[in-house]
C-alpha cells in the first residue's frame, strides 16, 4: 500500500471522521431549512461540498474507485454520496438554465445520514428487503384488483352518470339540445336535482331496487361522473382506481352508496367480496410480509 492509501484508510476508520461527516450532514440540513438564507451561507455551502468531496476522495483512495469487490462504487450507499457531489458541482459551475429543478437534489444530502448512523442503516436495509419480498404479494394484489376492476367495468360502466332530470322544459328544448349546452355549474343546477349541500346531482337508476327520483324528475344518463368526473367505472383505469379506493378504504362508503343508488342494492354483494378480499385479506397479507422481512433482518 502507498503511504497516501495508508493515511486514507486510517482517516476512514477513525471515529472522529464519522463524527465530522455526521455533524456536517446535520448542519447542512439545518441550513437547508432556512427560508431566506443570508449571502454568507453561500460560502458555507462551498464548505459542505468541500467536506463531502474530501470524504469521497478518502473513500476512493482507501478502497479504490470501481475495479474490485470492495471498491467505492460497489457499495450502493456510496452511489448516493457520488450523486450528491456531482449535483453540487453541476448546480454551482454549469449553467443549465432552470437550475431550481436540479437544486432539489440537494435534499439528497439529508439521506446521507442513513449511511452514517448504523441503526438507521439496518432499518433501511430491512425496508429494502421487505420491498423485494413484497413483489409476489404486489403481483397478487394487482391481479386481484384487475379482475375486480374488470367485473366492476362490466357491471357499472356508465351507471354513475345517471341523474335526476327536471320534467319541465321550454318549447324549443329537448334532452339532446340540453346535453349539448350543459357547461357551467349553474346549467347543471337548473336542470338536475341536487340534495341540499351536495356538489353532485342526485344519482338514480333504472332497475327496481336502485335509487328513484323525486316527483317532477326523471332518471337520465347525462353529463359527467360524480366528484368532478373522478369517480366512475367507465374505463379499466377508472375502475382500477375505484377498486384501489375500496381496498385502502379511502372514503369507500361514499363510492358504495353512489354505486348502489345508480345500479341497485343487489350489487352490495360485489362490495362485500371486494372489502373482505381486498381490504381485510390482501392488506393484512402485505403487513405480514413486511413484518416477516423485519424479523429476518433482525435475526
Amino acid at each position: 500500500f502507498s503511504p497516501l492509501r495508508r493515511i486514507s484508510i486510517k482517516i476512514l476508520v477513525h471515529s472522529l471522521f464519522s463524527m465530522l461527516i455526521m455533524c456536517t450532514i446535520l448542519t447542512n440540513c439545518i441550513f437547508m431549512t432556512m427560508n431566506n438564507p443570508p449571502d454568507w451561507t453561500k460560502n458555507v455551502e462551498y464548505t459542505f461540498t468541500g467536506i463531502y468531496t474530501f470524504e469521497s476522495l478518502v473513500k476512493i483512495l482507501a478502497r479504490g474507485f470501481c475495479v474490485g469487490e470492495f471498491t467505492f462504487l460497489r457499495d450502493p450507499w456510496n452511489w448516493l454520496d457520488f450523486v450528491v457531489i456531482v449535483f453540487a458541482y453541476l448546480t454551482e459551475f454549469v449553467n443549465l438554465g432552470n437550475v431550481s429543478a436540479l437544486r432539489t437534489f440537494r435534499v439528497l444530502r439529508a439521506l446521507k445520514t442513513i449511511s452514517v448512523i448504523p441503526g438507521l442503516k439496518t432499518i433501511v436495509g430491512a425496508l429494502i428487503q421487505s420491498v423485494k419480498k413484497l413483489s409476489d404479494v404486489m403481483i397478487l394484489t394487482v391481479f386481484c384488483l384487475s379482475v375486480f376492476a374488470l367485473i366492476g367495468l362490466q357491471l357499472f360502466m356508465g351507471n354513475l352518470k345517471h341523474k335526476c332530470f327536471r320534467n319541465s322544459l321550454e318549447n324549443n328544448e329537448t334532452l339532446e339540445s340540453i346535453m349539448n349546452t350543459l357547461e357551467s355549474e349553474e346549467d347543471f343546477r337548473k336542470y338536475f336535482y341536487y340534495l341540499e349541500g351536495s356538489k353532485d346531482a342526485l344519482l338514480c337508476g333504472f332497475s327496481t331496487d336502485s335509487g328513484q327520483c323525486p316527483e317532477g324528475y326523471t332518471c337520465v344518463k347525462i353529463g359527467r361522473n360524480p366528484d368532478y368526473g373522478y369517480t366512475s367505472f367507465d374505463t379499466f383505469s377508472w375502475a382500477f382506481l375505484a377498486l384501489f379506493r375500496l381496498m385502502t378504504q379511502d372514503y369507500w362508503e361514499n363510492l358504495y352508496q353512489q354505486t348502489l343508488r345508480a345500479a341497485g342494492k343487489t350489487y352490495m354483494i360485489f362490495f362485500v367480496v371486494v372489502i373482505f378480499l381486498g381490504s381485510f385479506y390482501l392488506i393484512n397479507l402485505i403487513l405480514a410480509v413486511v413484518a416477516m422481512a423485519y424479523e429476518e433482518q433482525n435475526q
Epitope: N167, T174, L175, F206
Partner: nanobody, 124 residues
C-alpha cells in the same frame, strides 16, 4: 336500431279530426322524460306541437292549444295526439319524439329518438 312506429296520418278536410299514434313498443325504450309530437311544414323548421311528460303533465304549442290533445297509454307504451278542428296550416309531416333513455343491451343511453314521420294533409 331503435324504432318508433307512427300511424294515423292522412288526408282530411278543414274542421275535421285525426288521431295520431306513436308506439315505442320495443323493449329498448326504458324511460322517457317526455314523448312528443313535432311537425315540419314544407320550407319551414321543425316545431313542437305537443308533448307529454312521463308523469302525465302536458305542454302545447300556442297553435295547438284548445284543438289538440295529447295522451298516453303506459301499458302499451303508446302516445296519442287527438287533432280536432284541423286547418290547412296544420298540413305537415308529423314526427314523434321519444326524449329519454334506451337500453342497448350493454348500457343505457339517453337522448332524442325520432320516428320516420306521418303525413297529415288538410285540404278541401
Amino acid at each position: 336500431e331503435v324504432q318508433l312506429v307512427e300511424s294515423g296520418g292522412g288526408v282530411v278536410q278543414p274542421g275535421g279530426s285525426l288521431r295520431l299514434s306513436c308506439a315505442a313498443s320495443s323493449r329498448q325504450f326504458i324511460r322517457d322524460v317526455f314523448t312528443g309530437w313535432y311537425r315540419q311544414a314544407p320550407g319551414k323548421q321543425r316545431e313542437l306541437v305537443a308533448r307529454i311528460y312521463n308523469e302525465g303533465n302536458t305542454q302545447y304549442a300556442d297553435s295547438a292549444k284548445g284543438r289538440f290533445t295529447i295522451s298516453r297509454d303506459n301499458a302499451k307504451k303508446t302516445v296519442y295526439l287527438q287533432m280536432n278542428s284541423l286547418r290547412p296550416e296544420d298540413t305537415a309531416l308529423y314526427y314523434c319524439l321519444f326524449s329519454g333513455t334506451i337500453s342497448t343491451g350493454r348500457e343505457y343511453r339517453s337522448g332524442d329518438y325520432w320516428g320516420q314521420g306521418t303525413l297529415v294533409t288538410v285540404s278541401s
